[in-house]
Interface confidence: low
């Protein structure tokens, strides 16, 4: 294997770095961009989709969780398979699964089916990160590897920017919708879900033009196929550099004898499904065996250390980046509540209310013979009030409650004032006629605040750009470990600044700072993971570590967001401790700069 690694490095040097790698860079970049988009889709559509699908808080939480769960399963599954079946083939299948179910999720109406589609869409895209980095690294010579893998990371950021920009451009346009009867509705948020499937679809189209990784071929004893691909790399680069006459001089490449080839059984043995069953079991056994070998004597220490680094990084990064918008929403809510207008002891008779009431408390009021027609109530509370001979018609409300109120001879016609909006209230001789159809839940709706989140995410992902550029330029100069540890320490320091962010704009600026600093850690971690494992274990290990990363993300998000409105200190402390632990673990890993790809 060492001999193959040295020879392969020499061949890649001869092939040069040029048009072939740059083409592959953009193709794989699209696949990575699809992953960057996936993380944001559900969060962005929730404010709009919650009304359409009548989502309770637990439903919304489950929807957010299911994406990470899907990506976790997908990373492990496709990562393992890509070491056995090939990088290109598995990436094509995983992206196809992603696009098909992302496409379906745009059209399905029910919550259950939407959840299922997003789960499978997540499973599909889960394969993107582990395969893309391994695949690209196998076309890069040692001197350029760190830098160009870091440039590739930029596409994850581009995915986030794309998702935020599209959400901003599409979701607020209520006009972009149609209805087929009362049962089928296609609103603008569904257009957004559809548009978010584009990077994945384009990646599939572009990937069909690219060859399989020659290193994978060599690892699986396919000498001729590997030679053809390497010749294609060489010839493409030489033609682009104006040297078409240069000949690919390699005649023989060392290959590894493949011992555990897929079990093949003769076509006359049993039914087709039995044959496929045997193949699947055989493949599953090989994938599992390969995974367990990452914990064998040779790799156990590296794997455990990498698990620690991936977990702490992900826990703090995802925890904080989801906590930020929640914190901003909390600050907005506090500010909104501070501006609540209180109306004590109103006595209103023979008046027609036909306008919007927002952010008000009416206390101890008496309403006699009043009409509430075509009224919009947003965050309005009526407390200890009396309504007598009143008439409510075409009333829509959100976050509106009647507490300890008495209604006498009052009629409610075509309103969404459902039972739960009357708290300890008494209704005497009052009737509800033709309550509004649809969702009986109180949804926050899509106000300016909801759309503000798209802009914040847009800024947050864009702020990563400088950190990305710096880390790419320095990756091969200062080394992966210094980059990882240094960036983790800087992220840790930037964490502490969060304690001073009391305004919305300060929190956004600090989110940008944290994102910009921590991206270098992610880039270094991706490069390290690719280089620490041999080619027959590379995507398996990467997939497992990426799955662990998603698990840590879910834990981080759950723990951090539970402190919103209680304390800022706990999340900051947790994140700082995790980052400090991560950087100390990172320093114990072996440096891979200047190393040939095993």
């Amino acid at each position: 294997r060492e001999e193959l690694a040295q020879q392969y490095e020499a061949i890649l040097r001869e092939c040069g770095h040029g048009r072939f790698q740059w083409t592959l860079y953009f193709v794989l970049g699209l696949a990575l961009m699809a992953d960057g988009v996936e993380v944001f889709v559900v969060g962005f559509v929730l404010p709009s989709a919650e009304k359409d699908m009548c989502l309770s808080d637990s439903n919304k939480g489950m929807l957010g969780l299911i994406v990470y769960l899907g990506m976790m399963v997908g990373a492990f599954l496709w990562g393992g398979l890509a070491d056995r079946l090939g990088r290109r083939q598995c990436l094509l299948i995983s992206l196809s699964v992603n696009s098909v179910f992302a496409f379906f999720s745009s059209f399905v109406q029910g919550y259950g089916t939407f959840l299922f589609c997003r789960l499978l869409s997540g499973v599909g895209i889960g394969g993107s990160i582990p395969i893309v980095f391994s695949y690209f690294s196998e076309f890069l010579a040692q001197e350029k590897r760190g830098e160009h893998l870091s440039w590739l990371c930029m596409f994850w950021m581009i995915g986030g920017v794309y998702a935020a920009a599209m959400a901003w451009a599409i979701i607020p346009h209520y006009g972009w919708s149609f209805q087929m009867g009362s049962a089928y509705q296609f609103h603008s948020w569904r257009v957004f879900v559809l548009v978010c499937a584009f990077p994945s679809v384009f990646a599939i189209g572009a990937l069909t033009t690219q060859p399989e990784s020659p290193r994978f071929f060599l690892e699986n004893g396919k000498h001729d196929e590997a030679w053809m691909v390497l010749k294609q790399v060489h010839d493409t680069n030489m033609r682009a550099k104006g040297h078409p006459e240069r000949v690919f001089s390699v005649t023989h490449i060392k290959t590894i004898h493949q011992e555990d080839e897929l079990i093949e059984i003769q076509s006359d043995t049993g039914a087709w499904y039995q044959r496929w069953g045997v193949r699947a079991l055989s493949l599953g056994g090989q994938v599992w065996g390969n995974f367990l070998s990452c914990f064998g004597p040779e790799y156990r220490r590296i794997t455990l250390m990498m698990m620690g680094v991936w977990f702490t990084m992900s826990f703090s990064y995802y925890g904080l980046t989801v906590w930020f918008p929640d914190m901003i929403r909390h600050l907005q809510a506090v500010d909104y509540a501070a501006r609540t207008k209180v109306f004590p002891g109103e006595r209103v008779e023979h008046v027609t209310f036909n306008f919007t009431l927002e952010n008000q408390i009416h206390r101890g009021g008496q309403y006699f013979n009043d009409k509430f027609i075509g009224l919009r109530l947003k965050s309005v509370s009526f407390e200890d009030s009396l309504f007598e001979e009143c008439y409510f018609e075409d009333v829509t409300s959100s976050n509106t409650f009647f507490r300890n109120c008495t209604f006498i001879n009052t009629v409610f016609y075509n309103t969404d004032l459902f039972e739960y909006k009357f708290v300890n209230s008494r209704l005497v001789n009052s009737t509800f006629l033709h309550n509004k159809e649809g969702c009986p839940l109180d949804v926050t709706g899509t106000g300016e605040g909801a759309y503000m989140v798209y802009f914040v995410s847009f800024l947050g992902t864009l702020a990563v750009l400088p950190g990305n550029i710096v880390s790419a330029l320095l990756m091969d100069k200062i080394g992966r470990l210094r980059m990882l540890a240094g960036s983790s320490v800087m992220s840790c320091v930037s964490c502490f600044f969060l304690s001073f962010g009391n305004s919305e704009s300060a929190m956004i600026a600090l989110l940008c700072l944290f994102g910009g600093v921590s991206i270098a850690s992610w880039n270094a971690l991706d490069v390290l993971t690719v280089e620490l494992y041999p080619s027959d274990k590379r995507t398996t290990a990467f997939g497992f570590l990426n799955a662990l990363c998603k698990l840590a993300a879910v834990l981080g998000i759950s723990i951090f967001t539970s402190f919103v409105g209680i304390t800022k200190a706990a999340p900051i402390l947790f994140a700082s401790a995790a980052l400090a632990l991560g950087s100390s673990l990172a320093l114990k890993l072996p440096e891979t700069r200047g190393q040939v790809l095993q």
Partner: nanobody, 119 residues
């Protein structure tokens, strides 16, 4: 758009009385609280008296006992009865629609009415 027209101002000797009126249009008068404000030369505009839609009144300390705010919902008018006037009451008086005491009024300001109490 809420429109406000103040009237009833004038010049009066110290200890005298005046009754200011304010006609309101462009809003459902009976559901809104109303306030009388004044602006003395070179000073900020300040709220001096307030009446809720239910008829509850509030005053600033320096006019309490001398000024009385009242409203007539049938005429969409709010009044300010000013007794025992002092030279320091000299100002332009405005009325406006306010959801509550201390909250920003939301009508567009009228021309106001000048009250002068010579020393």
């Amino acid at each position: 758009q809420v429109q406000l027209v103040e009237s009833g101002g004038g010049s009066v000797q110290p200890g005298g009385s005046l009754r200011l009126s304010c006609a309101v249009s462009g809003t459902i008068f009976s559901i809104n609280g109303m306030g009388w404000y004044r602006q003395a030369p070179g000073k900020q505009r300040e709220l001096v008296a307030y009446i809720t839609s239910g008829g509850t009144t509030s005053y600033v300390d320096f006019v309490a006992g001398r000024f009385t705010i009242s409203r007539d919902n049938t005429k969409n008018t709010v009044y300010l009865q000013m007794n025992s006037l002092k030279p320091e009451d000299t100002a332009v008086y405005f009325c406006n629609v306010a959801r509550n005491w201390g909250l920003e009024p939301f009508g567009s300001w009228g021309q106001g009415t000048q009250v002068t109490v010579p020393p």
